[in-house]
């Protein structure tokens, strides 16, 4: 059947919590990436952000699975849920800043 | 070497607000967050709340409406107040850092903890 | 709220026993859990996180184990100096909890 919010939302953090701690070399090659506006549609934000890195095989999980939290197909190149568009940073950075906000919405049970 | 240190009054009176600093050295309060604990004599510990290392915060919904916490990132210090002080809130205060690369919320260095007593 | 209930709330045993202290979420919190140890007039210690890391410096004869709503602390071989009060505590959701404790003392 299908994954319950919160399993899901449980599983992304844990999958940016190895890529943090495993992270040696700098995160998909210092690659930079779109910040966004850690509010509402941020999933498809995130992913309209990180689908534009290829060739970086330690995000391509994270980007299946916020591919799962995104109701529309999103393609390199868009950038609809993108509002803000002003600040690159690096994967690196993005990946930290992600975690915390999704942690805190796990804390206060924050899954949809 | 991580050190999180608490400083504040030791005996506090009945309505009045509690004022306590906790100033650390090791770490940075950007990189981690800072969490607040008590432990009434004798009881079990509670958790207060949490200065995230972006300067957000969250509490525990129970003691919400009587906490705040704020931060000094150039004095490494965080400060938690709490009003309308009770006997009831009479415990060892906390405050440790969390371990925050990791998917759970713990608590890896404590201070030593400073002693509140709520009396007229 | 999660309740962590622990026990036994305490218990005596004797250099070299095995000792095992158990905790019992009220709702299923994964692996989302600590345990700390705690000497009177200190603040506790950590010993594992994420239900069976072990802390850096934390001796090997502490282990933990379990998942989703019930966890254990195992001393494989008790030391003079493990006599103390022990805690768990779930990182899963706020507010975080801890159990009431389990005091060791010495038989």
């Known amino acids: 059947g299908p994954v319950p919010p919160s399993t899901a939302l449980r599983e992304l953090i844990e999958e940016l919590v190895n890529i943090t701690q495993n992270q040696k070399a700098p995160l998909c090659n210092g690659s930079m990436v779109w910040s966004i506006n850690l509010t509402a549609g941020m999933y498809c934000a995130a992913l309209e952000s990180l689908i534009n890195v290829s060739g970086c095989s330690a995000i391509e999980k994270t980007q299946r699975m916020l591919s799962g939290f995104c109701p529309h197909k999103v393609s390199a190149g868009q950038f609809s849920s993108l509002h803000v568009r002003d600040t690159k940073i690096e994967v690196a950075q993005f990946v930290k800043d992600l975690l915390l906000h999704l942690k805190k919405l796990f804390r206060e049970g924050q899954f949809n | 070497q991580v050190t999180l240190k608490e400083s504040g009054p030791v005996l506090v009176k009945p309505t009045e607000t509690l004022t306590l600093t906790c100033t650390v050295s090791g770490f940075s309060l950007t990189n981690y967050h800072v969490q607040w604990i008590r432990q009434p004599p004798g009881k079990c510990l509670e958790w207060l709340g949490v200065m995230w290392s972006d300067g957000d915060t969250s509490f525990n919904s129970v003691l919400k409406s009587r906490l705040t916490i704020s931060r000094d990132t150039s004095k490494s210090q965080v400060v938690l107040t709490m009003t309308n002080m009770d006997p009831v809130d009479t415990a060892t205060y906390y405050c440790?850092?969390?371990?925050?690369?990791?998917?759970?919320?713990?608590?890896?260095?404590w201070g030593q903890g400073t002693l509140v007593t709520v009396s007229s | 709220d999660i309740q962590m209930t622990q026990s036994p709330s305490s218990l005596s045993a004797s250099v070299g026993d095995r000792v095992t202290i158990t905790c019992l979420a009220s709702e299923d919190i994964s692996n989302y859990l600590a345990w700390y140890q705690q000497k009177p007039g200190k603040a506790p210690k950590l010993l594992i996180y994420?239900?069976?890391r072990l802390q850096d410096g934390v001796p090997s004869r502490f282990s933990g184990s379990g998942s989703g709503t019930d966890f254990t602390l195992t001393i494989s071989s008790l030391q003079p100096e493990d006599f103390a009060t022990y805690y768990c505590q779930q990182g899963y959701r706020f507010p975080l909890t801890f159990g009431c404790g389990t005091k060791v003392e010495i038989k």
């Open positions: 440790a850092r969390d371990g925050t690369i990791a998917a759970m919320d713990y608590f890896d260095y």
């Open positions: 994420h239900t069976s």
